[in-house]
């Protein structure tokens, strides 16, 4: 059924043209989970190609994916979430290539949202806060977040801070005065579940104030 060679030295005899990758999202719609797969080569002719998942499912042996443009998609409550599933690309009922995947190892969290930055004049710092839908979830509750910020004029000079909470303080003295900054955040699973970074949140832009000199202090 799997369509791949069982022999050790033939294990990579699958058709490379059909290599694909997938990610899962747990409780993405209420208690429904999703699984999204796509071919790594965007030029693959996907006409007549189907995806199917078998094994590690509740009550059913296999499920077929829906096709949405160039991606393949399942939304279901039927993932057992323990054990490996066999995900196959099929044409006319025949498997072209398959992968054994544990869906708990390919989790992609939802992007954080409501990112904002508030300047505290007295403390001379910036409080960064954001929200994540995962605080309400029952499975992927523990995340590591990556906050990235840059001065808008420095195209590729991103600074990164990793944190497990949804609040971060940036000290004013570590930022350039009177500058426009862009900041964004993404998340990755961080307890039992493994997988990929979420999409970035929408960026937030903030301006740092000019330096307030203390009385009697001269400008350089």
């Amino acid at each position: 059924e799997s369509g791949y060679a069982q022999n050790g030295d033939l294990e990579d005899a699958e058709l490379d043209d059909y290599s694909f990758s997938c990610y899962s999202q747990l409780e993405v719609n209420g208690s429904q989970h999703s699984l999204t797969c796509a071919f790594e080569d965007p030029d693959v002719n996907t006409t007549n190609l189907e995806f199917e998942i078998c094994g590690a499912l509740v009550e059913v042996k296999c499920l077929s994916f829906r096709k949405l443009q160039e991606i393949y998609f399942i939304e279901t409550k039927k993932f057992l979430l323990i054990g490996k599933s066999n995900i196959c690309v099929k044409v006319g009922g025949k498997s072209l290539t398959c992968k054994k995947i544990d869906l708990t190892t390919i989790v992609k969290p939802e992007a954080p949202f409501d990112l904002s930055v508030i300047y505290r004049e007295g403390a001379n710092d910036f409080v960064v806060t954001f929200n994540t839908s995962h605080l309400q979830k029952k499975y992927v509750k523990v995340l590591m977040h990556d906050v990235a910020y840059r001065q808008e004029k420095d195209e590729n000079k991103w600074m990164h801070v990793n944190l497990s909470s949804t609040k971060l303080t940036l000290l004013q003295r570590n930022l350039q005065p009177e500058a426009m900054y862009e900041i964004k955040v993404r998340s990755i699973p961080d307890h039992y579940f493994k997988g990929f970074w979420s999409e970035w949140s929408p960026s937030y832009y903030f301006r740092t104030p000019e330096i307030n000199n203390s009385p009697g202090e001269m400008d350089p």
Partner: antibody
Framework: QVQLVQSGAEVKKPGASVKVSCKAS????????LHWVRQAPGQGLEWMGG????????AYNQKFKGKVTLTSDRSTSTVYMELSSLRSEDTAVYYC???????????WGQGTTVTVSS | DIVLTQSPDSLAVSLGERATINCRTS??????????MHWYQQKPGQPPKLLIY???NLESGVPDRFSGSGSETDFTLTISSLQAEDVAVYYC?????????FGGGTKVEIK
């Protein structure tokens, strides 16, 4: 059928090293992680570590770090466990086991007895 | 490390009677409905054999007189009608956190 076949019993002197092999057959070698579990005489089971044959990535029980080295050879569908600086307490049956999921063991080798004695 | 405590240490049950083995963990091994507890049977001179994974899922080929239940820190393996071939040592194992630990074992005998 799915099988894990381990190398034969070994008798070693204290301070020596031993390398135990586990050959997989009946399934695609890179689809499943392989782990090692030991059982001292009359004792329970102790997870030592595991290896992902696809990537060569390893995970070790902290207790066995520096003592155990896991490797794999995709060309022969074989994983190896090397035990170094052997002591009498290392006398045990060593099992390789396939991980059917994270991390339970659905297929086991027959076991390899390692005896450490002067 | 998560400590798994099995009870009883040994159990003598008449043929056809129910055998119940408990496994208690030092911390939760559940994430919502995902229960990372597994059960094995080991007969003398043989490797362990997987019976139940994920607390309650029967491994393929295992007789349905074996069943598992439980969540969080308390789990149970039940043999509904003990057969002579069920004489063995039974182990629980958790896989929520490295190192993946086993219980000390419960020896099941015929009364």
């Amino acid at each position: 059928q799915v099988q894990l076949v381990q190398s034969g019993a070994e008798v070693k002197k204290p301070g020596a090293s031993v390398k135990v092999s586990c050959k997989a057959s009946g399934y695609r070698f890179t689809d499943y992680e392989l782990h090692w579990v030991r059982q001292a005489p009359g004792q329970g089971l102790e997870w030592m570590g595991g290896i992902d044959p696809k990537t060569g990535g390893t995970a070790y029980n902290q207790k066995f770090k520096g003592k155990v080295t896991l490797t794999s050879d995709r060309s022969t569908s074989t994983v190896y466990m090397e035990l170094s600086s052997l002591r009498s307490e290392d006398t045990a049956v060593y099992y390789c086991a396939r991980s059917g999921g994270r991390w339970y063991f659905d297929v086991w080798g027959q076991g390899t007895t390692v005896t450490v004695s002067s | 490390d998560i400590v798994l405590t099995q009870s009883p240490d040994s159990l003598a049950v008449s043929l056809g009677e129910r055998a119940t083995i408990n496994c208690r963990t030092s911390e939760s091994v559940s994430i919502h409905l995902l229960h990372l507890m597994h059960w094995y049977q080991q007969k003398p001179g043989q490797p362990p054999k997987l019976l139940i994974y994920g607390a309650s899922n029967l491994e393929s080929g295992v007789p349905d007189r074996f069943s598992g239940s439980g969540s969080e820190t308390d789990f149970t393996l039940t043999i509904s009608s003990l057969q002579a071939e069920d004489v063995a040592v039974y182990y629980c194992q958790q896989s929520i956190k490295d190192p993946y630990t086993f219980g000390g074992g419960t020896k099941v005998e015929i009364k």
